[in-house]
C-alpha cells in the first residue's frame, strides 16, 4: 500500500491555518480545487472549493475557510481562520478533474488546535488572537454543485505545504506555535 505522509500543524484557538498547495501550472491552473477533511471511517468530505473554472487570485470564502487560487504561481492558498479546537483533524487539498479521480496536491495536513491563553475563544477584541479582515469573496456556496467527484484515491506527490508569511490581512500572534512534523501512517 502507498504510504501517505502527513504534515502536522499545531496552532492555538483563534489563530489561522495558512497552507499553500503547489500544483502543475500548465496542467491544472483553471481546474476546480477543493479542501477536504478526512475522518476515520468516513469518505473525504469536501468543505470548500473554488469556482469552476477556478478564477485567478479570487478569494472564495465558505464559513471560516478561504481559498485563493494563484494561477501565476501554481498554488492554492487555503486559510482556516479563527481556529477552534473542533477543527482538529486530517485535511487534504485536491484538484477535480472529472471524469478522472481527484488529484491530491500535497501531503495531508494533520491540524491540531489547542486552547489558547485567552479565556474567550470567540472574541478578538480583548485577546491575543488573530486579527483577520475578510477579503472580498465570490460565493457563499460550498461548491458549484454540478461538479461531481468527491473522493481521493491517488497517491500524493511530495508535500509542498508551508506556513505563509503573515500579511496585512492575517496577523498570527505567534508564528512559533506552528510546528511541522512529517508523520508516516
Amino acid at each position: 500500500a502507498t504510504k501517505l505522509t502527513e504534515e502536522k500543524y499545531e496552532l492555538k484557538e483563534g489563530q489561522t491555518l495558512d497552507v499553500k498547495c503547489d500544483y502543475t501550472l500548465e496542467k491544472f491552473a483553471s481546474s476546480q480545487k477543493a479542501w477536504q477533511i478526512i475522518r476515520d471511517g468516513e469518505m473525504p468530505k469536501t468543505l470548500a472549493c473554488t469556482e469552476r473554472p477556478s478564477k485567478n487570485s479570487h478569494p472564495v470564502q465558505v464559513g471560516r475557510i478561504i481559498l485563493e487560487d494563484y494561477h501565476d504561481h501554481g498554488l492554492l492558498r487555503v486559510r482556516m481562520v479563527n481556529l477552534q479546537v473542533e477543527d482538529s483533524g486530517l485535511y487534504q487539498c485536491v484538484i477535480y478533474q472529472p471524469p478522472k479521480e481527484p488529484h491530491m496536491l500535497f501531503d495531508r495536513i494533520r491540524l491540531v488546535v489547542t486552547k489558547g491563553f485567552s479565556g474567550t475563544p470567540g472574541s478578538n477584541e480583548n485577546s491575543t488572537q488573530n486579527v483577520y479582515k475578510i477579503p472580498p469573496t465570490t460565493t457563499k456556496a460550498l461548491c458549484p454543485l454540478y461538479t461531481s467527484p468527491r473522493t481521493v484515491t491517488q497517491a500524493p506527490p511530495k508535500s509542498t505545504a508551508d506556513v505563509s508569511t503573515p500579511d496585512s490581512e492575517i496577523n498570527l500572534t505567534n508564528v512559533t506555535d506552528i510546528i511541522r512534523v512529517p508523520v508516516f501512517n
Partner: antibody, heavy 118, light 113 residues
Framework: EVQLVESGGGLVKPGGSLRLSCAAS????????MNWVRQAPGKGLEWVSS????????YYADSVKGRFTISRDNAKNSLYLQMNSLRAEDTAVYYC???????????WGQGTMVTVSS | DIVMTQSPDSLAVSLGERATINCKSS????????????LAWYQQKPGQPPKLLIY???TRESGVPDRFSGSGSGTDFTLTISSLQAEDVAVYYC?????????FGGGTKVEIK
C-alpha cells in the same frame, strides 16, 4: 436526462441470494459516489451502503455488514448490490441514489422490490 | 449513530395554510469550519422515490417551489411549507449526511384537512 434504473429484485427464500443492479445515464457516473437505500413496506428510509467513485471507500450499515456487497463498474455505468444470507427483515424496496458533492442524495432511482419469504 | 427524530408523525393542514415539520438530531450536524449543516429534507409521494427538497438545512434544491423552506442549525431543524398545495401531500423525511451511517428521521405524513 439524468437517470438511475434499478433491476434484479424479486421473491427469494430466507438464506437465499439476489444481485441488484442500477444502470446510470445522463451524467458522468465514474465521478460520483453512489448509495443503496432501502424502505421496508410502510416504513421509513434506511441507508444500506455507499461506495466512492473508484471503489476506494466502501461502507455498510451494521444490519447488512458481512452479508451484502456493494460494487460498481464505471465502464458499464452500473452499480451493484450482492445480497447473500437474506432474511425476512431485508424485505424492502431498494433504491440506488447518487451522492452529490455536498453529500446529499440528489438523484434516486424508482426502486426495485425485494421480498424474502418462505 | 446519529438518531434523527421527526415530529409530528402526521399532519393535516388546510389548503393554503402553513405546514411545519420538526427534526431533531441526537448530536450536532453543523460543521463549524464551513458553517454548513449536513441535513437534507426529502419528499416522497406514494409509489415514488424520495425527492431532494432542501440540503445544508436551508438551501432549496433547484426546481423546488419557494413555498418550501428549511431552517435551523446544530440539532434542531424545521421544514416549512408556507402555503400547502394539493400536490404537497406526501411523506417528508429529514436526513443527516454528516457521519456514517447516514440516518433518516421516521417521516412525517402531510395530508389535506
Amino acid at each position: 436526462e439524468v437517470q438511475l434504473v434499478e433491476s434484479g429484485g424479486g421473491l427469494v427464500k430466507p438464506g437465499g441470494s439476489l444481485r441488484l443492479s442500477c444502470a446510470a445515464s445522463g451524467f458522468t457516473f465514474s465521478s460520483y459516489s453512489m448509495n443503496w437505500v432501502r424502505q421496508a413496506p410502510g416504513k421509513g428510509l434506511e441507508w444500506v451502503s455507499s461506495i466512492s467513485s473508484s471503489s476506494s471507500y466502501i461502507y455498510y450499515a451494521d444490519s447488512v455488514k458481512g452479508r451484502f456487497t456493494i460494487s460498481r463498474d464505471n465502464a458499464k455505468n452500473s452499480l451493484y448490490l450482492q445480497m447473500n444470507s437474506l432474511r425476512a427483515e431485508d424485505t424492502a424496496v431498494y433504491y440506488c441514489a447518487r451522492t452529490r458533492i455536498d453529500d446529499s442524495f440528489d438523484i434516486w432511482g424508482q426502486g426495485t422490490m425485494v421480498t424474502v419469504s418462505s | 449513530d446519529i438518531v434523527m427524530t421527526q415530529s409530528p408523525d402526521s399532519l393535516a393542514v388546510s389548503l393554503g395554510e402553513r405546514a411545519t415539520i420538526n427534526c431533531k438530531s441526537s448530536q450536532s450536524v453543523l460543521f463549524s469550519s464551513n458553517n454548513k449543516n449536513y441535513l437534507a429534507w426529502y419528499q416522497q409521494k406514494p409509489g415514488q422515490p424520495p425527492k431532494l427538497l432542501i440540503y445544508w438545512a436551508s438551501t432549496r434544491e433547484s426546481g423546488v417551489p419557494d413555498r418550501f423552506s428549511g431552517s435551523g442549525s446544530g440539532t434542531d431543524f424545521t421544514l416549512t411549507i408556507s402555503s400547502l398545495q394539493a400536490e404537497d401531500v406526501a411523506v417528508y423525511y429529514c436526513q443527516q449526511y454528516d457521519l456514517l451511517p447516514y440516518t433518516f428521521g421516521g417521516g412525517t405524513k402531510v395530508e389535506i384537512k
